[in-house]
């Protein structure tokens, strides 16, 4: 059985299209699962990974390894 | 159970600003972007932009870009969606919905916010 | 930007009737495509997504089909319920575009 595009297993009832824009940046496997791409995670694969030791309660950030503090903090960590 | 929960209505006047909130409980509030999606009496279904709360990214329809902007708090797990230069055709019911669990769109709707613009 | 055209804008039917709505749209969505219920004063439910695929506790009486552009909503027997206005709507690529929607009255 040849599945439609984006759609993967038994049945082809698994959707999955490869993405890498704001609404996810992911890879699909040969089962139709998402595996994100480096630096992202997430279900959706849609939230950056921030720099390693940024504060998670006063950093943030919209792109992998970046580390933007809320306003207050400050800092290579925002701590 | 993912519950979506909106302030009450507002009566604006045309060139002022609103700021309606969307209250997310049920789920992890980062791992989703929240959407925006407006609807004028008797009229379709407008996208209006995404938020996405870990980081703040935003993606805007070209038509609302630079009078519309999407915040969120991640401490309190809720989204805002501020218009300003308010004008009458802007008066209708405001929703913030959510993504479902597979990739598919709006699974998830808030219950809506009517905002009326008159002099 | 992708533009989703719906039609019929409104359509009188019966109960039992079968009923079919279609969405085509302005660039190949390849099945990135919804479809919703919203009954007045009411927020929109989600019926259909990835263009086929039934959302959770929705009637089997819903199908979808289509591919590229063109897309179908049908009801296979209506129910009393089920006169509503219907929406499609593609999320291939933001903007995430509407079709102005199907009003389903009571013949």
């Known amino acids: 059985v040849t599945c439609d595009d984006y759609y993967y297993g038994f049945g082809c009832n698994k959707f999955c299209r490869p993405r890498d824009d704001f609404f996810g940046h992911y890879a699909c496997d040969q089962n139709g699962n998402k595996t994100c791409m480096e630096g992202w995670m997430g279900p959706e694969c849609n939230r950056a990974i921030c720099r390693q030791g940024c504060s998670p309660k006063h950093g943030s950030c919209k792109l992998p390894g970046d580390c933007r503090c809320q306003y207050g903090w400050q800092g290579l960590y925002c701590d | 159970q993912v519950q979506l929960v909106q302030s009450g209505a507002e009566l604006k006047k045309p060139g002022s600003s609103v700021k309606v909130s969307c209250k997310a409980s049920g789920y992890t509030f980062t791992d989703y972007e929240m959407h925006w999606v407006r609807q004028a009496p008797g009229q379709g279904l407008e996208w209006m932009g995404a938020i996405q709360p870990g980081g703040g990214g935003t993606a805007y329809a070209q038509k609302f870009k630079g009078r519309v902007t999407l915040t969120a708090d991640k401490s309190t797990s809720t989204a805002y969606m501020e218009l300003s230069s308010l004008r009458s055709e802007d008066t209708a019911v405001y929703y913030c919905?959510?993504?479902?669990?597979?990739?598919?769109?709006?699974?998830?709707w808030g219950q809506g916010t009517l905002v009326t613009v008159s002099s | 930007d992708i533009q989703m055209t719906q039609s019929p804008s409104s359509l009188s039917a019966s109960v039992g009737d079968r009923v079919t709505i279609t969405c085509r749209a302005s660039?190949?969505?390849?099945?990135?495509l919804a479809w919703y219920q919203q009954k007045p004063g009411k927020a929109p439910k989600l019926l259909i997504y990835n263009a086929k695929t039934l959302a959770d506790d929705v009637p089997s009486r819903f199908s979808g089909s289509g591919s590229g552009t063109d897309y179908t909503l049908t009801i296979s027997s209506l129910q009393p319920e089920d006169f509503a206005t219907y929406y499609c709507?593609?999320?291939?690529?933001?903007?995430?575009?509407f079709g102005g929607g199907t009003k389903l009255e009571i013949k």
């Open positions: 709507q593609h999320f291939w690529s933001a903007p995430w575009t």
């Open positions: 919905t959510r993504r479902g669990y597979d990739d598919y769109p709006f699974a998830y």
């Open positions: 660039g190949n969505i390849h099945n990135y």
